[in-house]
Interface confidence: medium
Amino acid sequence: QSPIFGPQDVSSIEGNSVSITCYYPDTSVNRHTRKYWCRQGANGYCATLISSNGYLSKEYSGRASLINFPENSTFVINIAHLTQEDTGSYKCGLGTTNRGLFFDVSLEVSQVPEFPNDTHVYTKDIGRTVTIECRFKEGNAHSKKSLCKKRGEACEVVIDSTEYVDPSYKDRAILFMKGTSRDIFYVNISHLIPSDAGLYVCQAGEGPSADKNNADLQVLEPEPELLYKDLRSSVTFECDLGREVANDAKYLCRKNKETCDVIINTLGKRDPAFEGRILLTPRDDNGRFSVLITGLRKEDAGHYQCGAHSSGLPQEGWPVQAWQLFVNEESTIPNSRSVVKGVTGGSVAIVCPYNPKESSSLKYWCHWEADENGRCPVLVGTQALVQEGYEGRLALFDQPGSGAYTVILNQLTTQDSGFYWCLTDGDSRWRTTIELQVAEATKKPDLEVTPQNATAVIGETFTISCHYPCKFYSQEKYWCKWSNDGCHILPSHDEGARQSSVSCDQSSQIVSMTLNPVKKEDEGWYWCGVKEGQVYGETTAIYVAVEERTRGSPHINPTDANARAKDAPEEEAMESSVREDENKANLDPRLFADEREIQNAGDQAQENRASGNAGSAGGQSGSSK
């Protein structure tokens, strides 16, 4: 399929002008390459009529132009003074020859329609209202007034002043006079449908003294606006149907042969194919609304229509707006996982791509909610506090210059299942949708922290260990302290790295973190995790409580914040605290010797405290063993 896109059918009348917009993929080569407009001949040859290289054919001389708009990735062909000879098949395209990338366009130029003398032409869109003006002389002021529609030689009455209304115009046509006017009456026809188009005659009086006016009504199908979007990007349909339908239910539907299937409406209907990737936003109180669809797929291409009706469904005779969406498969947006799987108690690391040209843009992550119109409250962002209920288990890691950021969510529960969006406040095309599926865990987590009930005592030394399996042997291990603006990596000791690389003893793979001496501000959530370069992997979280040791008082933990992930009964918590003291007694003295060596090597004493927030992987690896 060619990535060039334009209007398939263009129609106009003699003497008028047309403007044809063709879209091309946004690449530097395309922006600079030759653009052309050619006419398809019967022999298969396409004769150039105008090109961006400056060529202009004789038959287009003085009446056509081709303008490139590189900032929009479009070029526009303007043709004036149309004649019926311009009817035919054309191509708009890119390339040094006319066999390059192109889109077929059919142009039809028809004759100016001939009407009886003094015919007033009314042009209205489907669903709108027309007011036909009918003038008469004073002599017919008290005579019967009527409007009829020409069908061949006959003229069938639509409405008259005796209150007759043709059934097909019932509740749509009214005949009235304004104020004190004695020489004019009006007929309103609302909810116009295509079959209303035609020649109407309005009449006051009967016989030869009757006053007659001719009116030609043209009912226009909405001209679809062309939308050119990349695969995996997003599209916004901006719908403005007017104040008259401000209070009616709104919908967006997709045309399917004769029908238009509703994708979303304000009454809560939503097509399952768009679950998790669609939002309907009212724009104001005048009936304007927009529909945003993310994660565009090839099959999303097609004709769309928005409308309003109390049923929330397409209804003939109600105003609509139309679009034709083209999905360019030569996308600049990288292919990322659309489904991420996790298990209860575990974690997920979700990679969110963004436009690399906008590395300074603000990054966000939101949870799509299936209320009637869809909404997506932000859970975390580069300048947004982590939302309630996600403290200690959600963080966003920006990797400037890489064109991606990572969101980590741990302590997973089945309630976390659902759809999430990666957003930036910059290029809105780069909105990606991820479905998170959380299943019940069937085995122990890969990362385990001991002690599980962590209470540190102010002024003392406190060490916490993270056990990891051999499969993480070659990966970088880290500890970080979680805060509302991320998880800052700390210095830690990887004891597993001391082992021979030939064998891996599952029981001795430990990365530990020491708080020395413990301070009140050390209290909070800590994460143990693994990563390879900029690629984050599994994490686990633990809440470290900090208390003052009062002389002679037993060491009892406060309510265990870690129970959220572990659900440990109180008796176990007590036992853990005893084991924790035992662990302290049996700490490997080499750890402390290693710490002293590092300090003597010139590191600041403060940096050796875990809460010193080294703030980067470098800080951690500096004191890993």
């Epitope: 916004t236 939002l279 309907l280 936003t281 009212p282 104001d284 909404r375 409250p377 932000v378 969006w421």
Partner: nanobody, 121 residues
Framework: QVQLVESGGGLVQPGGRLRLSCAAS????????MAWYRQAPGKQREWVAI???????HYADSVKGRFTISRDNAKNTVYLQMNTLEPEDTAAYYC???????????????WGQGTQVTVSS
């Protein structure tokens, strides 16, 4: 959820100048276009100037060359510098912004309460 607050209006003589400011606040995720509109007594509200997110600016013919719109994205603020004011510029000036909030990333129009500009000798 989103508030727009205008300031800087007042009474000025023909040929004088004023600078209007409008600050957006609330749970803002992103702002697309910021614009100034005005409404004179008995007339329709009309747009005066638009500052698009990408940096481009647009002006109504009646103010071209006299008014300058600018915006500070970091402060979510838009300004309108009005020079060589004429009596025809007398109107209530309204700030408009297309804002996506932290709850709803789709864009929606928000309006300020308006600030009165009177040009009279």
């Amino acid at each position: 959820q989103v508030q727009l607050v205008e300031s800087g209006g007042g009474l000025v003589q023909p040929g004088g100048r004023l600078r209007l400011s409008c600050a957006a606040s609330g749970s803002i995720f992103s702002i697309r276009d910021m614009a100034w509109y005005r409404q004179a007594p008995g007339k329709q509200r009309e747009w005066v100037a638009i500052a698009a997110r990408g940096g481009s600016t647009h002006y109504a013919d009646s103010v071209k060359g006299r008014f300058t719109i600018s915006r500070d994205n970091a402060k979510n603020t838009v300004y309108l510098q009005m020079n060589t004011l004429e009596p025809e510029d007398t109107a209530a000036y309204y700030c408009n912004a297309e804002v996506a909030t932290m709850i709803q990333p789709g864009f929606r129009d928000y309006w300020g309460q308006g600030t009165q500009v009177t040009v009279s000798s």
